[in-house]
Every structure is written in structure tokens, then in C-alpha cells.
Interface confidence: medium
């Protein structure tokens, strides 16, 4: 369905508010260092231009592609070369190479200051003074720090952000009302960003076949009553939506996401009984609700899979004649029967099934060869089950902070070349799996845990790709998307690693430690723990525990002292000396 003017088409479909929000997000994700005012100016210019095209689709330049229009606009930024260096060279290219160039320069770890939350009264004043600017600033600040954030979902977060201020700035106790809501939005936002980053990595590094396989498995778990053809249609549409968003085509992505939500709500009967409450909501909320909807109940009378996929004499015929359809149907049938399995496990099983058919359908007696294929699945199923069981037991025994520390030690020993801030960030997030998943009933633990770990390990892969330092990390990240987690789990102590020389400066602390929040204190201690392991990779758990206990005691003592700085200056070197002796 072609339009004379793409920009007019999207403006009319999305409406001015969403159009402006999405263009701001797109520009902020591309030019992450540009000041807010510059982006607002560019967005206003694009919006005015779009309005002229709505009035007359034949007007000059209205027939240009969105990439051409947006790219031309970004390339008018005066300080492009000074601020972005070689990214400015993108502007010498023609579309579609120019957009690809901009995409390649998106920075997953931009050098931006952490967002500081002002006093509640200050925020409420800013909100009341200029609500529109306040909300635009939110979109800008989140988008530039999370260049792959799912744009239509960010509009939903902004709507919730607005609602929180509208409600709480009227409340008697503004802070008690607002702060928990902002904490929730921040945490949910980080999680949403990380989940979307995995989808984009899946599409960009492993292709749309990998993404479609993921989507077949996940949607079959969610919608076990839907027929395969219905799931396939949803997968095709969902792949288009995410391909567009990951490719920077945010207007098309948001428009297609709205169409998908409309389709799902019009076809609830053939998809899931759980969609009803989502479909009564307004657009942004509806799309979010549909994405997060709980699994429908499994049909009661599902027959055994063995009949069609093991016992049938037509297995090789069906596989040969339509490989991807046959494997897709296998994945659909397996996933709808197993909401208790992680998506990654289901994909491993499909991969194992494919490998067996490749081998057996070429053999003299195919049927005899693949007759035991389901037995081969057992070790693949037991591995994540055991992993979840062991780690949940460890989490329950240690609590979150000490569980994170155990993971910090484990991962630093596996890949000590990785930077300390990355190891701390990734291990802290890996450790959050405990609180998130271990409290769930058995049937929900594995999908929660393993699919969450895949998201966190993708963050490690993305950061490592920017500055590669470890062949082991590169291997685990690039060889197989579905086997990333087992690959990292299987890594042992890196025997080839040359321990880092001891640097007393790394273990020198000051009185400012005492004013830090609990979380910031933990990060400081965990940073020291990683550095200790890098210095002594073969240190035992007991040795490390002893040093960390001494560290906590030393910090506590000095933070209670009258002259805190003098205490740190005096006790610090003693702590360092004692630690070196303990680890010798």
C-alpha cells in the first residue's frame, strides 16, 4: 500500500503527539551527545514540514523517504564532526548506506553522566511550569542512554511518567506518592531496554530466522490454543515490527505495532482467552498489555508429539519438502505443551531435532535412526533445571548481595580480561535473577530464570563487542544465540590469564564512602572484590570472604569515627597489608 508522501502518511496515522515523540526518540538515539534544545529544534522543523505534506502530498520533497528526510536533517547539525568524529562521515553516504552507518555508530555505553533525581518540589515545579518540555526531556534522556529502547513502548513509559506527576504533585505527601512510582518506572525501563536489546541483537547478529524461531516458541507458549497458521501470522507481523524499530524506522514500527494490536483484538477468539482485558485499554496501554499477557491455558486433549515427529514414516518426507515449516510446527507443538521450559531450551530442542533429521534422513534406515530422538532431549532439559535448582538454593542461602558476590567471583574467574565496571554491572544483574525468579512456583522458574539470564548476558556481549578483550567471550557471544548461557556456564577458571599487578590505589578509600547510598556502597565493595580476584584468580572462597568481611568492618569502623578521613588514611593501609597477607 503505497503513499505519495510517506511522512504525511505516518503523521496522519500516528497523530501529531506520537509523531513528534517518535521523531525525538529517533534523533536522540542516533545523536546521543546532542543537547536537548538542538533536538527539539530539529523535531519542530520536521513536524512543520510533515504538516505541509499533509496539506499537499505533492509539495516539494514530500515524496522523499523517511530515511532521506531524517538523515538530511541530522546532517545539518553544525557540530557533527567535533562531537561525533567519524560518524560525520555517514553524511557523505547515500541512503540506504547512510542510515546503516548511523545505526553502526549507536553507542550502547555512551559517556553520559548518570541521571540525578532532583528534589520532588523542584520536579513538580518543572512539571507544572511546562509539562510538554518536561515530558520531552524524559524521552530525550532515556532514548540517548538506551539507543535501542523500543520506541512505542517508550511513549507508554512517558505516559505513565506524566500520570505519576499529575497525581503525585497534587498529593499531601508528594515524595511518598512519587518516589516509589519513579523507582518502578526506572527499574521497568531498564528491564524493557535490555529485553529489546536482545531482540535487536538477535535480528542484527543472527538474522530474522533466529528471531522468528524465538517468536514462534514464545507465542506458542502464550497462545497454546491458537493454530499454527495463526501463530505464524503473528510471528511474521511481530518480526516486521521489531525489524523496523531495531533499524531506526520508528514511525513505521509504531504504526505497524498499532495495526498488530488491532488485529489481535479483532481476532481474540482464534488467539487467546486472555486478551480481553487488554483490548479495552487505550492504544499504548493496550500494546503493552498484549506484549505482557499471561499464558493462556493449554488445551486439555493435546496428543503425544511422538506420533507426528518420531513414529510417522513421513517425517523425512515432511522435513525435506518444507524444512522450515516442519521445524516451525515442531517448535510450535513442543512450546505450547511446555510453558514450563525456557524459550532458549525450546530452541535448543528444535536445533537438536533438526540435527537428528539431517543425520538420520540421510541414513540407510531413517526411522530406526531417529526413533530415540526424544531421549536425546533429556540431558538438554536437565541442564537448565539443575542450574536453576542449584542457583536458587545458593540465593536462598546467601541473600541477594552475597549471591551477587558469588557470581562476581565466578564470572571474574571465567573472563578476567573483561573490564571491572562491566563485570560488576553484569554480575549484579545476573544476581537479580534470584529475587525475580526463585520465589516463583517450580513450573515458572526455568522460563523466568534462563530467559532473564539471556537478556543479561546479551548486555555483556554488546559491551564486549564495543571493546573486545576476551576470545572466550567473543566465542560464547557469536557462535550460537541459543547456547550463549550454557557456553558461559561451561567456562572454567582462565588458566592462561596473567594476574593483574597489585595496585594499592585501587584499594584506597576515603570518607566519601560514608555518605553513599547502600547500593553505591555495595558497588564500591563489589568493584574491590573483582579487583581482588583479578589480582589473585586462584583465591579460595574462604580467603575472599575473609577479606570482604574485614573490608566491611573497616568501612563501618571509619564511618563511625569522629575524624572519618583520618581513620581511612590510617586504617586503609593496614587493611591493604592484611588483605595481601591473607591472599598470599
Amino acid at each position: 500500500d503505497t503513499h505519495k508522501s510517506e511522512v504525511a502518511h505516518r503523521f496522519k496515522d500516528l497523530g501529531e503527539e506520537h509523531f513528534k515523540g517518535l521523531v525525538l526518540v529517533a534523533f536522540s538515539q542516533y545523536l546521543q551527545q546532542c543537547p536537548f534544545e538542538e533536538h527539539v529544534k530539529l523535531v519542530n522543523e520536521v513536524t512543520e514540514f510533515a504538516k505541509t505534506c499533509v496539506a499537499d502530498e505533492s509539495a516539494e520533497n514530500c515524496d522523499k523517504s523517511l530515511h532521506t528526510l531524517f538523515g538530511d536533517k541530522l546532517c545539518t547539525v553544525a557540530t557533527l564532526r567535533e562531537t561525533y568524529g567519524e560518524m560525520a562521515d555517514c553524511c557523505a553516504k547515500q541512503e540506504p548506506e547512510r542510515n546503516e552507518c548511523f545505526l553502526q555508530h549507536k553507542d550502547d555505553n555512551p559517556n553520559l553522566p548518570p541521571l540525578v533525581r532532583p528534589e520532588v518540589d523542584v520536579m513538580c515545579t518543572a512539571f507544572h511550569d511546562n509539562e510538554a518540555t518536561f515530558l520531552k526531556k524524559y524521552l530525550y534522556e532515556v532514548a540517548r542512554r538506551h539507543p535501542y529502547f523500543y520506541a512505542p513502548e517508550l511513549l507508554f513509559f512517558a505516559a505513565r511518567y506524566k500520570a505519576a506527576f499529575a497525581e503525585c504533585c497534587q498529593a499531601a505527601d508528594k515524595a511518598a506518592c512519587l518516589l516509589p512510582k519513579l523507582d518502578e518506572l526506572r527499574d521497568e525501563g531498564k528491564a524493557s531496554s535490555a529485553k529489546q536489546r536482545l531482540k535487536c541483537a538477535s535480528l542484527q547478529k543472527f538474522g530474522d530466522r533466529a528471531f522468528k524461531a524465538w517468536a514462534v516458541a514464545r507465542l506458542s507458549q502464550k497462545f497454546p490454543k491458537a493454530e499454527f497458521a495463526e501463530v505464524s501470522k503473528l510471528v511474521t507481523d511481530l518480526t516486521k515490527v521489531h525489524t523496523e524499530c531495531c533499524h531506526g524506522d520508528l514511525l513505521e514500527c509504531a504504526d505497524d505495532r498499532a495495526d498488530l494490536a488491532k488485529y489481535m483484538c479483532e481476532n481474540q477468539d482464534s488467539i487467546s482467552s486472555k486478551l480481553k482485558e487488554c483490548c479495552d485499554k487505550p492504544l499504548l496501554e493496550k500494546s503493552h498489555c498484549l506484549a505482557e499477557v499471561e499464558n493462556d491455558e493449554m488445551p486439555a486433549d493435546l496428543p503425544s508429539l511422538a506420533a507426528d515427529y518420531v513414529e510417522s514414516k513421513d517425517v523425512c518426507k515432511n522435513y525435506a519438502e518444507a524444512k522450515d515449516v516442519f521445524l516451525g510446527m515442531f517448535l510450535y507443538e513442543y512450546a505450547r505443551r511446555h510453558p514450563d521450559y525456557s524459550v532458549m531450551l525450546l530452541l535448543r530442542l528444535a536445533k537438536a531435532y533438526e540435527a537428528t533429521l539431517e543425520k538420520c534422513c540421510a541414513a540407510a534406515d531413517p526411522h530406526e535412526c531417529y526413533a530415540k530422538v526424544f531421549d536425546e532431549f533429556q540431558p538438554l532439559v536437565e541442564e537448565p533445571q539443575n542450574l536453576v535448582k542449584q542457583n536458587c538454593e545458593l540465593f536462598e542461602q546467601l541473600g541477594e548481595y552475597k549471591f551477587q558476590n558469588a557470581l562476581l567471583v565466578r564470572y571474574t574467574k571465567k573472563v578476567p580480561q573483561v573490564s571491572t565496571p562491566t563485570l560488576v554491572e553484569v554480575s549484579r544483574n545476573l544476581g537479580k535473577v534470584g529475587a525475580k525468579c526463585c520465589k516463583l512456583p517450580e513450573a515458572k522458574r526455568m522460563p523466568c530464570a534462563e530467559d532473564y539470564l539471556s537478556v543479561v548476558l546479551n548486555r555483556l556481549c554488546v559491551l564486549h563487542e564495543k571493546t573486545p578483550v576476551s576470545e572466550k567471550v567473543t566465542k560464547c557471544c557469536t557462535e550460537s544465540l541459543v547456547n550463549r548461557r550454557p557456553c558461559f556456564s561451561a567456562l572454567e577458571l582462565d588458566e592462561a590469564y596473567v594476574p593483574k599487578a597489585f595496585n594499592a590505589e585501587t584499594f584506597t578509600f576515603h570518607a566519601d564512602m560514608c555518605t553513599l547510598s547502600e547500593k553505591e556502597k555495595q558497588v564500591k565493595k563489589q568493584t574491590a572484590l573483582v579487583e581482588l580476584v583479578k589480582h589473585k584468580p586462584k583465591a579460595t572462597k574462604e580467603q575472599l570472604k575473609g577479606v570482604m568481611d574485614n573490608f566491611a568492618a573497616f568501612v563501618e569502623k571509619c564511618c563511625k569515627a569522629d575524624d572519618k578521613e583520618a581513620c581511612f588514611a590510617e586504617e586503609g593501609p593496614k587493611f591493604v597489608a592484611a588483605s595481601q597477607a591473607a591472599l598470599a
Epitope: 523425512c316 518426507k317 522435513y319 539431517e358 534422513c361 541414513a363 540407510a364
Partner: nanobody, 116 residues
């Protein structure tokens, strides 16, 4: 080193026949399923047919069923594709490939043109 060398392509009229051959070397031919894949001008790859290692089982795409026959001679390490009742839409480069459906090696291809 695995080598697959196709031959037998050429220009043929609609309704005519051709027989493609593929000489294989560098691997144990009779341990491997083999297949044919084609690519029409400006189109993507399309699977045509597969034969099991011992030649007992053969598989065809719907578009060629009843017209094409895949066979092999394990003593000569050679794969064949007999193409009858050829149509204009069969015009393509035909590749011989090693594997069942997840082909790991391909030949250079032989061009088949069906035109009056």
C-alpha cells in the same frame, strides 16, 4: 577438499528434457544425502530435490513433483537430475549440494534455460 561439479545444463524448448549430472569428490559420497537447489534470475534459492545416502528415499518440491527424478550412482560418486516436461519457470541456475536440507557444500551451478 570437497568439490561438486555440475554439468548438463543448456537451452531447451518448453516440454523438452535435460539430464544434469554432478561429479563429487573430497568426501565419502555414499555416506551423505545429496540434493539439487535452483536460483531463477532475480529470485532467491529454491530447494528442488533430495536423495538419501543409499538412494532408497527421494524427496521433491511440489513445483517439480512428477516431472523431475533425482538419482545417484554411488560407484561413480555422481548425482543426477532428470528433468522432463520443462517449463519456462524452470529456467534457473541449478546447484548440486551436499546434505539433506541443511546443505553445507555447493557446486558452481549449471544454467538451464527453457525458452522457445
Amino acid at each position: 577438499e570437497v568439490q561438486l561439479l555440475e554439468s548438463g545444463g543448456g537451452l531447451v524448448q518448453p516440454g523438452g528434457s535435460l539430464r544434469l549430472s554432478c561429479a563429487a569428490s573430497g568426501f565419502t559420497f555414499d555416506n551423505n544425502a545429496m540434493g539439487w537447489v535452483r536460483q531463477a534470475p532475480g529470485k532467491g534459492l529454491e530447494w528442488v530435490s533430495t536423495i538419501s545416502a543409499n538412494g532408497n528415499a527421494t524427496y521433491y518440491a511440489d513445483s517439480v513433483k512428477g516431472r523431475f527424478t533425482i538419482s545417484r550412482d554411488n560407484s561413480k560418486d555422481t548425482l543426477y537430475l532428470q528433468m522432463n516436461s520443462l517449463r519456462a519457470e524452470d529456467t534457473a541456475v541449478y546447484y548440486c549440494a551436499k546434505g539433506f536440507r541443511r546443505f553445507d557444500y555447493w557446486g558452481q551451478g549449471t544454467l538451464v534455460t527453457v525458452s522457445s
